[in-house]
């Protein structure tokens, strides 16, 4: 028996369902009574779900997993993981034994898009050219950690005087706060881009500072 899984990681959004694909080629005359299918966490060997002794033994992993029972006899040993969480990320091993045995591992990469950044200024009034201003770009509830880029109105990257902090909340999602300290010119637009490296999703925020009231 040869077990096959996808070589590329499975990317799943937080709170959605994911399918970890695993298949094998049943011999003629194969019976489900002969099948021993075990899904486990690769590193710890913790049992996730199993089908043994001719029956689905159920989820051993927070009751959020399921097999595709009607497809098992055709060699489909895939695992459905419901309501994906950040803590589900990692490698899962699909072990199949009938008479012979084989196993293969598939990686689950969890992701969550970042919110549109909100921009704040300090100070936020009586701004004059030559003043030092602090611009904060905040984006929330993303995963994994973001990449943050700053640019001026001409698209020139701003790398000096940037401090970025990322804090995980109780669900493991990150809130990003990036602070740019800059000396004001006569007029200026400052843009912040928050990129999710897994989803290749960019969230943009900008602020334009003129002699007039500020525009966000």
């Amino acid at each position: 028996v040869e077990v096959q899984v996808s070589e590329d990681p499975v990317v799943a959004l937080v709170d959605t369902d994911a399918t970890l694909r695993c298949s094998f080629s049943p011999e003629p005359g194969f019976s489900l009574a002969q099948l021993n299918l075990i899904w486990q966490l690769t590193d710890t060997k913790q049992l996730v779900h199993s089908f043994t002794e001719g029956r689905d033994q159920g989820s051993a992993y927070s009751n959020r997993t399921a097999l595709f029972p009607d497809l098992l006899v055709q060699g489909n040993a895939s695992l459905r993981l419901q309501r994906v969480r950040v803590t589900d990320e990692g490698s899962y091993t699909c072990f199949v034994s009938i008479q012979d045995f084989d196993s293969a591992a598939v990686s689950l990469q969890v992701a969550a898009p970042y919110s549109k950044p909100s921009m704040t200024l300090e100070p936020n009034k009586d701004l004059r050219p030559g003043n030092m201003v602090t611009i904060t770009c905040s984006s929330y509830q993303g995963y994994p950690e973001a990449e943050v880029f700053w640019k001026d109105g001409q698209g020139v990257p701003l790398t000096g005087n940037v401090t970025t902090s990322q804090m995980a909340n109780e669900r493991g999602l990150f809130d990003v706060h990036s602070v740019l300290r800059v000396v004001l010119g006569a007029n200026g637009t400052y843009s912040c881009l928050v990129r999710n490296p897994v989803l290749q999703q960019d969230a943009h925020g900008s602020v334009t500072i003129t002699g007039q009231p500020l525009t966000f």
């Epitope: 021993n36 075990i38 199993s50 002794e53 034994s97 008479q99 012979d100 084989d102």
Partner: antibody, heavy 118, light 110 residues
């Protein structure tokens, strides 16, 4: 006739190496998973290692992990067990076993004796 | 110390019925098929029961296997002198990724 014949056992000093072979006949070796099982003098059976038909998935008992290596040559119908860093507690009769996860360990060789002693 | 536990010895008189137990856990005996092996003195083990309760061809129907929860049993009815041997249970353990054998039970026919 279905048969498994082990060879390569003998006396070896602690820290030494030995390579066991198992010649299979009478069944489709290339389609069968295989086990090594050992039995120390006067003791019970202890599983050592399992290898699938293609040699792509292998498991070891914790007691031998990192010291023993199982392999197979399907063109020669032969199973191997390379034993390094041998210890006195590895002294045992080593059995080559045809493994079927459903039908069980249905064919056993007669065993070969490994003695680790100075 | 075996992951799967068997009584070290059992005995019976000819014609009697004896039972050998095999106690494991949810990661082996409790959720996997159990096999039983007979080892006559000075010989290699022989498969006696597979898939918990099935007999290979050639094994007398005096031998039977069963399971309840995380314990399996081998029953031998109509005990005969040639049944004097060591008996081992075995199962795959999915938390160890290993085959586990019971420590063995020496059956004596009195």
């Amino acid at each position: 006739e279905v048969q498994l014949l082990e060879s390569g056992g003998g006396l070896v000093q602690p820290g030494g190496s030995l390579r066991l072979s198992c010649a299979a006949s009478g069944f489709t070796f290339s389609g069968s998973a295989m086990n090594w099982v050992r039995q120390a003098p006067g003791k019970g059976l202890e599983w050592v290692s399992a290898i699938n038909s293609g040699g792509t998935t292998i498991y070891y008992a914790d007691s031998v992990k990192g010291r023993f290596t199982v392999s197979r040559d399907n063109s020669k119908n032969t199973l191997y067990l390379q034993m390094n860093s041998l210890r006195a507690e590895d002294t045992a009769v080593y059995y080559c076993v045809k493994l079927d996860f459903y039908y069980g360990m249905d064919v056993w060789g007669e065993g070969t004796t490994v003695t680790v002693s100075s | 110390q075996s992951v799967v536990t068997q009584p070290p010895s059992a005995s019976g008189t000819p014609g009697q019925r004896v039972t050998v137990s095999c106690s494991g856990s949810s990661s082996n005996v409790g959720s996997k098929y159990v096999q039983w092996y007979q080892q006559l003195p000075g010989t290699a083990p022989k498969l006696l029961i597979y898939a918990t309760d099935r007999r290979p061809s050639g094994v007398p129907d005096r031998f039977s296997g069963s399971k309840s929860g995380t314990s399996a049993s081998l029953a031998i009815s109509g005990l005969q002198s040639e049944d004097e041997a060591d008996y081992y249970c075995a199962s795959w353990d999915d938390s160890l990724n290993a085959w586990v054998f019971g420590g063995g039970t020496k059956l004596t026919v009195l």
